[in-house]
């Protein structure tokens, strides 16, 4: 007996071939001997089966001695043995219909779990193997679970169901809802405008929710809410914003915040959370602000940074086109009695300059100029 695997909701074509390459009488029945369809000359006739409105054939193949049974919009309960009667012969085909569904929404928050459930006909013993977009394989029986979804799990999951050495492939599109970056650092000189961007790693037609940016300044003992906002159909509207600092927010996606001035008291780290409508849990992105200030007071030239810097970062003071006068893995460096000229304060990571501030030191009879 030939075995054919089908997918729930799909179309299957069961073949039946006569030895004569011409249109002759045929009919298809189910295991209960109820007629599904057949022919009368060049016309298709249908029987009283449950498949009535979903069963079809291809007249174009009848002349070649092929009499297929097409079953549309397959259901699990269509699993059965189908019998084709032609030329006093009987051809039996066993159809097994499977369904594979994500038993939650296919749009999941980063860190959540994905469960895939296999629907199968009674008496079948299928095995399932799924391959994630990043090439990770998972195997299982009736259910497959993946915990702690990551951004790279977004995309098409390809699942193969094996039964009777036959296979059927399912493709399920999964969208992991997350920000493109888990965290980011912005390096700014004191007084510069700061732009924070929070691009999403997914696109959906309608996006509604609410969000908040909490900020922990390095100098402050506790964190505070800088801004709260609503998101409606990808349009952003500010609900509440602190007076200091007075943040501005873009009205469209990606989420965009502007801090008018980088000041030492703002240096620190923030956490932007976004709660999406009809989703449990929140999206998070960490953002860090590092602020640099170079100053000259009397005979002391000082360079300082505030904010979350890694211990391996190097802070240096150097006269333009000369070797660094001072270079330390600290958050403040200074030079006593600096020579006149353009001094550079550099924050660097393995030789790569992250932040630079210039200060002009004038001969001792005049006051310093900050460009």
């Amino acid at each position: 007996k030939k075995v054919v695997l089908g997918k729930k909701g799909d179309t299957v074509e069961l073949t039946c071939t006569a030895s004569q390459k011409k249109s002759i009488q045929f009919h298809w029945k189910n295991s209960n001997q109820i007629k599904i369809l057949g022919n009368q000359g060049s016309f298709l006739t249908k029987g009283p089966s449950k498949l009535n409105d979903r069963a079809d054939s291809r007249r174009s193949l009848w002349d070649q001695g092929n009499f297929p049974l097409i079953i549309k919009n397959l259901k699990i309960e269509d699993s059965d043995t189908y019998i084709c009667e032609v030329e006093d012969q009987k051809e039996e085909v066993q159809l097994l219909v499977f369904g594979l569904t994500a038993n939650s929404d296919t749009h999941l928050l980063q860190g959540q779990s994905l469960t895939l459930t296999l629907e199968s006909p009674p008496g079948s013993s299928p095995s399932v193997q799924c391959r994630s977009p990043r090439g990770k394989n998972i195997q299982g029986g009736k259910t497959l679970s993946v915990s702690q979804l990551e951004l790279q799990d977004s995309g098409t999951w390809t699942c193969t169901v094996l039964q009777n050495q036959k296979k059927v492939e399912f493709k399920i599109d999964i969208v992991v809802l997350a920000f493109q970056k888990a965290s980011s650092i912005v390096y700014k000189k004191e007084g510069e405008q700061v732009e924070f961007s929070f691009p999403l790693a997914f696109t959906v037609e309608k996006l509604t929710g609410s969000g908040e940016l909490w900020w922990q300044a390095e100098r402050a003992s506790s964190s505070k809410s800088w801004i709260t906002f609503d998101l409606k159909n990808k349009e952003v509207s500010v609900k509440r914003v602190t007076q200091d600092p007075k943040l501005q927010m873009g009205k469209k996606l990606p989420l965009h915040l502007t801090l008018p001035q980088a000041l030492p008291q703002y240096a620190g780290s923030g956490n932007l959370t976004l709660a999406l409508e009809a989703k449990t849990g929140k999206l998070h992105q960490e953002v860090n602000l590092v602020v640099m200030r170079a100053t000259q007071l009397q005979k002391n030239l000082t360079c300082e940074v505030w904010g979350p810097t890694s211990p391996k970062l190097m802070l240096s003071l150097k006269l333009e086109n000369k070797e660094a006068k001072v270079s330390k893995r600290e958050k403040a460096v200074w030079v006593l009695n600096p020579e006149a000229g353009m001094w550079q304060c550099l924050l660097s990571d393995s030789g790569q300059v992250l932040l630079e501030s210039n200060i002009k030191v004038l001969p001792t009879w005049s006051t310093p100029v900050q460009p």
């Epitope: 799909d10 179309t11 298709l44 007249r59 174009s60």
Partner: antibody, heavy 121, light 107 residues
Framework: QVQLVQSGAEVKKPGASVKVSCKAS????????MHWVRQAPGQGLEWMGI????????SYAQKFQGRVTMTRDTSTSTVYMELSSLRSEDTAVYYC??????????????WGQGTLVTVSS | DIQMTQSPSSLSASVGDRVTITCRAS??????LAWYQQKPGKAPKLLIY???SLQSGVPSRFSGSGSGTDFTLTISSLQPEDFATYYC?????????FGQGTRLEIK
Amino acid sequence: QVQLVQSGAEVKKPGASVKVSCKASGYTFTSYYMHWVRQAPGQGLEWMGIINPSGGSTSYAQKFQGRVTMTRDTSTSTVYMELSSLRSEDTAVYYCAKDIVHDGTEYFQHWGQGTLVTVSS
Amino acid sequence: DIQMTQSPSSLSASVGDRVTITCRASQSISDWLAWYQQKPGKAPKLLIYAASSLQSGVPSRFSGSGSGTDFTLTISSLQPEDFATYYCAQHNHYPYTFGQGTRLEIK
């Protein structure tokens, strides 16, 4: 949603062959047959043949028998139509079309965007 | 091969008009006929199948009738987007054949 994306325009010399591809997505590739229909500039539509992507069986219009070959690659969900011994009258837009079956009859439900094949010396 | 003949080959009409296009088969094709709409530079689109069944998503102002050898496509009230070329096609048996087309233009 069903999408049929065809390969780009081709310019061929008389006597040469052309192979046009049609990549299917948005449905189970092996569950529906694919037809090829062509349309000469400013002219009507002409059916060329059909392929069953599941088994690869084909049926061609008598007019193209011996010159046309339809094949498929199930791993990439792509069907191909190759036409050989090209002549100037083969200059046309070639379409692939996925069918729908209703009461035993095939109709052309979804069409590719078309591929212009120009045969010129 | 079954020959399909459409008339008229071109037709001028105004928005809101009722328009009828006819198609004749050289032999009986029962109701195995389809109507396709084609706009310049685009692929054809299935409007009607089985002579009178409206394809999903097609506006109800389009209707088809006929059986055997004579068929008609009717547009009850022309809309600006309906100006195109219309083809009938027999799907009785291979090779499937099309009418020469009816070009519907704005008057």
